[in-house]
Amino acid sequence: GIAIPRNSGCPNSEDKNFPRTVMVNLNIHNRNTSTNPKRSSDYYNRSTSPWNLHRNEDPERYPSVIWEAKCRHLGCVKADGNVDYHMNSVPIQQEILVLRREPRHCPNSFRLEKILVSVGCTCVTPIVHHVA
Amino acid sequence: GIAIPRNSGCPNSEDKNFPRTVMVNLNIHNRNTSTNPKRSSDYYNRSTSPWNLHRNEDPERYPSVIWEAKCRHLGCVKADGNVDYHMNSVPIQQEILVLRREPRHCPNSFRLEKILVSVGCTCVTPIVHHVA
């Protein structure tokens, strides 16, 4: 097997709980986190399962702004603009990694957290449960 | 903006580029990744804009496996199962954070990276460009 050398070029950790506490470089490629998804596409308006985007802001979290999709209708929009309740608008969810300040208000100490966000909506055929 | 106090209980940072490099506690909340509500839906099959999930694997990244949605059709599926090409299936994209070891093989040093993933597909009315 490969024995990984404790590289002299590696940041050193004095933390007793090492490696539970690590250094993370936030100098991200493509760092503009709060890009409003409305700007990148208008699918949220043109979809047969349209959604509204709600700004979820938390200064104790990185990224501090996350956009949450909320489906506008229970049903799906037909070509004539009316809602078809024989179909369902449902949120598409994605689990994402975020950093949360811990202890709170410490500028350079974070905890890794997983959260579930709704990214947009899609129109699905409902599951019909037949009663025997 | 919020002025974050330099809390005496906070870990100290000697980094000149602070807060570009931060300390992260890896005791993740919701570590139990295998109990993901998102995993249990079959919207990808039941959607009027169904999609297939393709594996994007990178052993030097966490998460090592990310699933990319690829819309099955250019159009959207009608109630009779046929595809309506007057409508478009389009991918809904989301920017997510991933962790990458940097320098490689350093056990306590990571870099946060942003990647754009397609989470699922939605059915939209096409934009019609009229020629003068």
Partner: antibody, heavy 117, light 106 residues
């Protein structure tokens, strides 16, 4: 090509503990989890728990909670599974497997643990 | 825990036969279903992941289908090296395996 090489067979007394090792050769652990799966003689497969060596995150099956401890040493690319308070029904082949958190794509050769008085 | 039920528990078939094994989950698991092959004294081998994706290096005679609660593994033309035990496994929740299906020579 990733290979997982496990430690040799063990014979243990009831009430004792066993620690099985799993060494990744031909590559590091990378960012995958390592899961432990056991198989009693003539029986099916049973997942016990997992660890992500990069972070030290562990996740245990309810059934083994409190009795199993999974650890990893990145410097030697080795994962360990320790099972305590052994009983005869723990006699099984114990496998480690590389776990993408979606499937197990590489497996160790297995370690037979026999619990007998 | 999500229970996985395979059927049949064993089957006899001849070389060249088309073989189908089914797996049912006690609740919906989307497509998070894998299939493994295990030969006597050996570790399991991943054949199919995410219900229908063929793992690299696995012959194309193996295919998987299904979504939600019902899944199928098909071997289109059984070869001598395919006689083994086959397991389904879900990863929608903490992993659980089916009880196995033994494919024997007729």
């Amino acid at each position: 090509q990733v290979q997982l090489v496990q430690s040799g067979a063990e014979v243990k007394k009831p009430g004792s503990s066993v620690k099985v090792s799993c060494k990744a050769s031909g590559g590091t652990f990378s960012s995958y989890a390592i899961s432990w799966v056991r198989q009693a003689p003539g029986q099916g497969l049973e997942w016990m728990g997992s660890i992500i060596p990069w972070f030290g995150w562990t996740n245990y099956a309810q059934k083994f909670q409190g009795r199993v401890t999974i650890t990893a040493d990145e410097s030697t690319s080795t994962a360990y599974m320790e099972l305590s308070s052994l009983r005869s029904e723990d006699t099984a082949v114990y496998y480690c497997a590389r776990d993408s958190e979606y499937y197990f794509d590489h497996w160790g050769q297995g370690t037979l643990v026999t619990v007998s008085s | 825990d999500i229970q996985m039920t395979q059927s049949p528990s064993s089957l006899s078939a001849s070389v060249g036969d088309r073989v189908t094994i089914t797996c049912r989950a006690s609740q919906g698991i989307s497509n998070w279903l894998n299939w493994y092959q295990q030969k006597p004294g050996k570790a399991p081998k991943l054949l199919i992941y995410a219900a229908s994706s063929l793992q690299s290096g696995v012959p194309s005679r193996f295919s998987g289908s299904g979504s939600g609660t019902d899944f199928t593994l098909t071997i289109s033309s059984l070869q001598p090296e395919d006689f083994a035990v086959y397991y389904c496994q879900q990863y929608s929740d903490d992993p659980t395996f089916g009880q196995g299906t033994k494919v024997e020579i007729k």
